[in-house]
């Protein structure tokens, strides 16, 4: 038997993916474990094999269908179980009644691009990926800009409290290399969390014109 504290956390990407992480102190790395999804009002069941991501945690993705298909709604409840093999039998290690739209984590924004860049400002746009049409405009964003000599953790967060898939960065330094990231979060859901940060977009401001003040 496996002893120790266990944590089983899952998030729904709002379309066709439930990502799960199971942590168990003292669990065996070579044990075969599955996450089993049993919806209360759907005809399908789904499993995914947990793969080790660290000494005491495992992860997998329940892929429910094509990436942009709407597989669950706000009224669905999915019973999620972690089952691990013990000899010829399977033991339930963790269980939760999962409400997908209370546990949202969207995919990171994609397709970041510089729309327009000047000496002191830069206009950047992006797109959201695999986000449910249920949200309509009820999304918010956080953005951050990496300046030379700083870390991402030091970058101030810019908050966009509406579904605005662009930003105009101001007060930038001419002829300077920057990087930019953005993340998204639905307003819905008690346990909803921010998406991962987007891939960083590198850009450079234009040099100041010669003979002019900057």
């Amino acid at each position: 038997a496996v002893n120790g504290t266990s944590q089983f956390t899952c998030f729904y990407n709002s379309r066709a993916n439930i990502s799960c992480v199971w942590s168990q102190d003292g669990a065996l790395q070579d044990t075969s474990c599955q996450v089993h999804a049993w919806p209360d009002r759907r005809r399908w069941n789904q499993t995914c094999e947990l793969l080790p991501v660290s000494q005491a945690s495992w992860a997998c993705n329940l892929i429910l269908g094509a990436p942009d298909s709407q597989k669950l709604t706000t009224v669905d409840i999915v019973t999620l179980r972690v089952l691990c093999r013990e000899g010829v039998r399977w033991r339930v290690m963790a269980i939760q009644d999962f409400k997908p739209f209370e546990n949202l984590r969207l995919m990171a924004p994609i397709s970041l691009q510089v729309v327009h860049v000047e000496t002191h400002r830069c206009n950047i746009s992006w797109e959201i990926s695999q986000a449910s049409h249920y949200f309509e405009r009820h999304l918010e964003f956080e953005a951050r800009t990496l300046s030379p000599g700083h870390t991402w953790e030091e970058a101030p967060l810019l908050t966009l409290k509406q579904k605005q898939e662009w930003i105009c960065l101001e007060t930038l330094t001419p002829d300077t290399q920057y990087e930019f990231q953005v993340r998204v979060k639905p307003l819905q859901g008690e346990f909803t969390t921010w998406s991962p940060w987007s891939q960083p977009l590198a850009f450079r401001t234009k040099p100041a014109a010669l003979g002019k003040d900057t």
């Epitope: 075969s32 599955q34 089993h36 399908w44 069941n45 789904q46 499993t47 995914c48 094999e49 793969l51 997998c60 892929i63 429910l64 269908g65 094509a66 990436p67 089952l83 399977w90």
Partner: nanobody, 123 residues
Framework: QVQLVESGGGLVQAGGSLRLSCTVS????????MAWFRQAPGKEREFVAL????????EYVDSVKGRFTVSRDNAKNTVYLQMNNLKPEDTAVYYC????????????????WGQGTQVTVSS
Amino acid sequence: QVQLVESGGGLVQAGGSLRLSCTVSGDVFVRYTMAWFRQAPGKEREFVALVTDSGRTTEYVDSVKGRFTVSRDNAKNTVYLQMNNLKPEDTAVYYCAANTDYFRIRSLDANTWGQGTQVTVSS
């Protein structure tokens, strides 16, 4: 709806090898635990091997362990059964099967079956 198409069967002498392939279309391949079953003339269909969605875990019926290897290529939407040291008792129609639920596929409960490919092992 998901479709499965097997290939690679044929006639082979005892001790020989064959590689069966099963290509999946119509759905997201990595959703599925994939399995091979076989049915010999006058016998019931039996489980041969399976591979989980990630490809990390494989399982076999005792009679083929050490001779057969199941694998999958998620980029090619294909599952394989490499059969070595074939024996006359391996003669059967081999079926590929898919289920999104790992716990159901072992009990012949598949979402979808292929049409089967004949493997004949002569002595």
